[in-house]
């Protein structure tokens, strides 16, 4: 699998789609993990609604959330109030029993707020009264690694 | 009308190959997995191993992992199972069948091939 | 690989009488699982998907029941043609596996 880099802001909401067959998949939960080192395990973060069928209601994990177009074969992750912790290599998953089927490797990566001057103990964080479908989601920048680019950053 | 035509019966010895094959019509053949499922003579069913035709993605029983092939071919909408050497002890009927899909998932297997007999005996 | 145990293995019944078959699961399946009716000779025929829905064509005098575990065919009222092997199948996981069948005879 080659590896699909999405930028976001920080502090706003990145957008994440992996395309799949939707023949070939169906029937089948997904699931968004976290990658843990280059050849570590894939931790999950949040997975589709157990009924399948009902895979295009949106579900959350903090401030992940995952949705299914089981027909049009897109699943879409939205990483909301995105942080530098956030940055790092996930996996969208296609589940078969306790099998996992990897549909796209993603690099996301966090950029600076450019209009933001604050210091890092100031970044806002949402309220509980502040609902979580208003908030704004900014168009992605992605881009597959160039053959060669190395995901994770050579330790030492 | 969906079907699932397999090719003839078959008679051959020890150490030979085989190819035999499971051609699809009335359906869009690589959009639908495909299942081959092993009778021996007397003896229930036994899954061997799928294939999605759209891309070739297969998956294999342990059992049968090494000891047979299971490819596609969706420009002629056919599977095939192979054996590079036959041993006495794969002497069964080989069923092909398509993996269902229904408005809740998937639908178990809905449509077989009729079967066919593979004799291996010196 | 998940075992599937199937009982009985055989049974014998008359016409009009009620048959059940069980299927039990070595681990949770969902409703992942499906059963096959095949007469000698013949290529097996689906019968119950998704552990309790009927295909188009399938007698209504079979059903199937059960989730988790255990899972259930019933023939209300068996018929002539009705005399065959009764196999279940999971396909939640791969492998995917058969139970080893259920031979339904003529008392």
């Known amino acids: 699998h080659n590896t699909t880099v999405f930028q976001g802001v920080a502090g706003q909401s990145l957008q994440v789609s992996c395309p799949y067959d939707s023949m070939k998949h169906w029937g089948r939960r997904k699931a968004w993990c976290r990658q843990l080192g280059e050849k570590g395990p894939c931790q999950r973060v949040v997975s589709t609604h157990n009924l399948w069928l009902l895979s295009f209601l949106r579900r959350w994990n903090g401030s992940t959330a995952i949705t299914d177009d089981t027909l049009g074969g897109t699943l879409t992750i939205t990483l909301r109030n995105l942080q530098p912790h956030d940055a790092g290599l996930y996996q969208c998953q296609s589940l078969h029993g306790s099998e996992a089927d990897t549909l796209r490797k993603v690099l996301v990566e966090v950029l600076a707020d450019p209009l933001d001057h604050r210091d890092a103990g100031d970044l806002w964080f949402p309220g509980e009264s502040e609902s979580f479908e208003d908030a704004h989601v900014e168009h992605s920048i992605s881009r597959s690694l160039l053959e060669g680019e190395i995901p994770f950053p050579p330790t030492s | 009308e969906v079907q699932l035509v397999q090719s003839g019966a078959e008679v051959k010895k020890p150490g030979e190959s085989l190819k035999i094959s499971c051609k699809g019509s009335?359906?869009?053949?690589?959009?639908?997995?495909i299942a081959w499922v092993r009778q021996m003579p007397g003896k229930g069913l036994e899954w061997m191993g799928i294939?999605?035709?759209?891309?070739?993605?297969?998956r294999y029983s342990p059992s049968f992992q090494g000891q047979v092939t299971i490819s596609a071919d969706k420009s002629i909408s056919t599977a095939f199972l192979k054996w590079s050497s036959l041993k006495a002890s794969d002497t069964a009927m080989y069923f092909c069948?398509?993996?269902?899909?229904?408005?809740?998932?998937?639908?178990?297997?809905?449509?077989w091939g009729q079967g066919t007999t593979v004799t291996v005996s010196s | 690989d998940i075992q599937m145990t199937q009982s009985p293995s055989s049974l014998s019944a008359s016409v009009g009488d009620r048959v059940t078959i069980t299927c039990r699961a070595s681990q949770g399946i969902r409703n992942d699982l499906g059963w096959y009716q095949q007469k000698p000779g013949n290529a097996p025929k689906r019968l119950i998907y998704?552990?309790?829905s009927l295909p188009s064509g399938v007698p209504s005098r079979f059903s199937g029941s059960g989730s988790g575990p255990e899972f259930t065919l019933t023939i209300s009222s068996l018929q002539p043609e009705d005399f065959a092997t009764y196999y279940c199948?999971?396909?939640?996981?791969?492998?995917?596996?058969f139970g080893q069948g259920t031979k339904v005879e003529i008392t």
């Open positions: 998704a552990a309790s």
């Open positions: 294939i999605y035709p759209g891309d070739s993605d297969t």
């Open positions: 199948l999971q396909h939640n996981s791969y492998p995917w596996t």
């Open positions: 069948a398509r993996q269902g899909i229904e408005v809740t998932g998937t639908g178990g297997l809905d449509v």
């Open positions: 009335g359906y869009s053949f690589p959009s639908y997995w």
